[in-house]
Every structure is written in structure tokens, then in C-alpha cells.
């Protein structure tokens, strides 16, 4: 079955810094979403080879892409405290396939020592059952951190 390898599992970065999230699959995709999870899931990007990527207005001007839809690295720049959260890759094939999630912890520079990532990935046991056409769960609540403020979801 198709899988999405997502890395890193967790990263701690100071305000204003950048983070790379990589979504890798064995190919055969129509495209890939990066979604910020929470009670109100938030699409960050939709990337499809040969098509202009769709980017949420909150991240416009601070997202870069490298690679192809099968092995995509998404770079989020100038991170803000409100960008803290769990981000998951959703690969669109004949079914939906989900990555394990990346917990991004954006911290005030002076409090770097307070919040650190453990080596463990986001806990899959906390995730709800997947939709019927999904190969892996869509983790709506993988982060134990409070959700950032909701942002506009216009493409």
C-alpha cells in the first residue's frame, strides 16, 4: 500500500526562523496537501506537479517548495507563535494517504530551553478513525498544544 514518509516528527524553532517539512511517497500521486491540524483543520498548501501551488493566505510569501510532488520539501519562513501546531501531509492517490505528522513548536527566543521536542513522533493512538477511502488516519488532534488562532482558508 502507498505510504507517506514525513519528516521531521518534531522541530523546535525560534520566532522568525524557517522550518522544512518533507513528504515522500513511492509515486503515483495526483497531488499533496500540507494541513495544519486542530478542531478546524487548515490547509496550508496544495502542490501538484505542473500546476501553480495553492497557498493559504496566512502563509503567502513565506512558503517555498523544492522537489516534486512525490518527494516534496515545504519550507515555511518567518515563523510566528501562531504557526505552532501539528502539520500533516495528505497524498492524493486513488485513496487518501496521510503522513505521521510534524509537530512544529515556535518559541520566543528567550524561552528556547522551555519547549523541546522529544524523539517520539506524534502519537498515532490519539488519532481518530480514518475516512473510509483513507489508507491512514487523518490526525485531527495529534498535538497536545493549544490550537493557534484560526486563519483564513482562501486559496
Amino acid at each position: 500500500a502507498q505510504e507517506v514518509q514525513q519528516s521531521p516528527h518534531c522541530t523546535t524553532v525560534p520566532v522568525g526562523a524557517s522550518v522544512n517539512i518533507t513528504c515522500s511517497t513511492s509515486g503515483g500521486l495526483r497531488g499533496i496537501y500540507l494541513r495544519q491540524l486542530g478542531p478546524q483543520p487548515q490547509d496550508i498548501i496544495y502542490y501538484e506537479d505542473g500546476v501553480v501551488p495553492t497557498t493559504d493566505r496566512r502563509f503567502r510569501g513565506r512558503i517555498d517548495f523544492s522537489g516534486s510532488q512525490d518527494n516534496l520539501t515545504i519550507t515555511m519562513h518567518r515563523l510566528q507563535l501562531s504557526d505552532t501546531g501539528t502539520y500533516t501531509c495528505q497524498a492524493i492517490t486513488e485513496v487518501n494517504v496521510y503522513g505521521s505528522g510534524t509537530l512544529v513548536l515556535v518559541t520566543e527566543e528567550q524561552s528556547q530551553g522551555w519547549h523541546r521536542c522529544s524523539d517520539a513522533p506524534p502519537r498515532a493512538s490519539a488519532l481518530p478513525a480514518p475516512p473510509t477511502g483513507s489508507a491512514l488516519p487523518d490526525p485531527q488532534t495529534a498535538s497536545a498544544l493549544p490550537d493557534p488562532p484560526a486563519a483564513s482558508a482562501l486559496p
Partner: antibody, heavy 117, light 107 residues
Framework: EVQLVESGGGLVKPGGSLKLSCAAS????????MSWVRQTPEKRLEWVAS???????YYPDSVKGRFTISRDNARNILYLQMSSLRSEDTAMYYC???????????WGAGTTVTVSS | DIQMTQTTSSLSASLGDRVTISCSAS??????LNWYQQKPDGTVKLLIY???SLHSGVPSRFSGSGSGTDYSLTISNLEPEDIATYYC?????????FGGGTKLEIK
């Protein structure tokens, strides 16, 4: 059992507006993309709009700038705001669960929109 | 846009017959093709997704096949409740597009 129930259709004059609703039950609404599809009086099916579970929206050129799809995950309701309506928008409007970006696995019974002076 | 063509707009067959409905795309759609059934009362149901995968609850007498630009839906043993209009739909690229439908009637 997944159920989708459309409402809000009716008779409207050209240039007018109408807002359709689709109430969903029996599913984790926030986990799914949703779509609107219409059927013309000639029985042709036309895709009208889609919204991903994370809120990205998609439209064909024929309705772009006139129709807006939105969702209320707290209330499990899908909306279609239609403005600057034209006679060619006359159709039965169906909402559908969009299982995998275009694979519409559950459909409602539809609501009729008639645009006529 | 990808154009979907169902060349047969209506088809008449006898109960127990094997019926095949065809659909062609104006360009390759990589098997991203669905088949829907619309009953006379307007109810729409998904039958087949991704060319040949049977949707849950759909009788096994329905099957789909094809590749590239040419696809087909087969009903192996026609039953009275199969009287309906059948539509193909591509979901390879936006905008999603449907065929014009094939209305199936009983002889």
C-alpha cells in the same frame, strides 16, 4: 448511515442571489472534502464547487467569482452562496461527500434552483 | 478541460442480459474514472471508483474496466432495479467533468 440534505432552492430572478445549505449527518464532517454538483434541465451533470477538509476551495470557470462554497464544521453544514445568477444556472443542485478529491461517494437528494424573470 | 463522451445516450436490453456502457476521455485520465447511477426519482449513487473498484454495497454484477482514454461499465445480469441513467466522471484534473449519460431501459 451518512445523510446529506440540501435546502434553500427556489425561484430567483436573473442577477439575483440564493444561498443553498447541505446538512450532513452520520459522518465526521470535518474530515471530508465536500462538493456541489448540478444537473441541468437537459440532464447533464456539472461540477460546481469543492471545498477540502482544510478549507481550500475550487470552482470551474463558469461559476468562479459568482459562487462561493463554505463550510461550518461545528454545525456540519455545507453552503453554496450563489450571486449574479443567470438562466443557465437553473438546475437541480446536489451536495456530495468528496471522498478523494473528486470521488463523490455519497449524494444528497438535491434542491431545485430556477432562474427566471 | 477534459471532455467525457458517452456515445450511446440510450440503450435497451432484456432482463438477464449482459450490458456494457462505454465512456471516452479527450485525454488520458490515468484510471481516475467513476461511474454513477441515477434512478428515475433523481437519486444518485456511486457504483465504481478508480475505474474498477466496486463501491461498498454495490452488487457484484457491476464491474468497470479501461485505461488511458477508454473506459466501460458492465452489468453482467440485468435486473429490474438497474433501470437508470449511468454517468461516467473523470477526477484526474480539475474541473471534474461528466459524460452525458446513458439511459438504460428494459426491452
Amino acid at each position: 448511515e451518512v445523510q446529506l440534505v440540501e435546502s434553500g432552492g427556489g425561484l430567483v430572478k436573473p442577477g439575483g442571489s440564493l444561498k443553498l445549505s447541505c446538512a450532513a449527518s452520520g459522518l465526521t464532517f470535518s474530515s471530508y472534502a465536500m462538493s456541489w454538483v448540478r444537473q441541468t434541465p437537459e440532464k447533464r451533470l456539472e461540477w460546481v464547487a469543492s471545498i477540502s477538509s482544510g478549507g481550500f476551495t475550487y470552482y470551474p470557470d463558469s461559476v468562479k467569482g459568482r459562487f462561493t462554497i463554505s463550510r461550518d464544521n461545528a454545525r456540519n453544514i455545507l453552503y453554496l452562496q450563489m450571486s449574479s445568477l443567470r438562466s443557465e444556472d437553473t438546475a437541480m443542485y446536489y451536495c456530495a461527500r468528496d471522498e478523494v478529491r473528486g470521488y463523490l461517494d455519497v449524494w444528497g437528494a438535491g434542491t431545485t434552483v430556477t432562474v427566471s424573470s | 478541460d477534459i471532455q467525457m463522451t458517452q456515445t450511446t445516450s440510450s440503450l435497451s436490453a432484456s432482463l438477464g442480459d449482459r450490458v456494457t456502457i462505454s465512456c471516452s476521455a479527450s485525454q488520458g485520465i490515468s484510471n481516475y474514472l467513476n461511474w454513477y447511477q441515477q434512478k428515475p426519482d433523481g437519486t444518485v449513487k456511486l457504483l465504481i471508483y478508480y475505474t474498477s473498484s466496486l463501491h461498498s454495497g454495490v452488487p457484484s454484477r457491476f464491474s468497470g474496466s479501461g485505461s488511458g482514454t477508454d473506459y466501460s461499465l458492465t452489468i453482467s445480469n440485468l435486473e429490474p432495479e438497474d433501470i437508470a441513467t449511468y454517468y461516467c466522471q473523470q477526477y484526474s484534473k480539475l474541473p471534474y467533468t461528466f459524460g452525458g449519460g446513458t439511459k438504460l431501459e428494459i426491452k
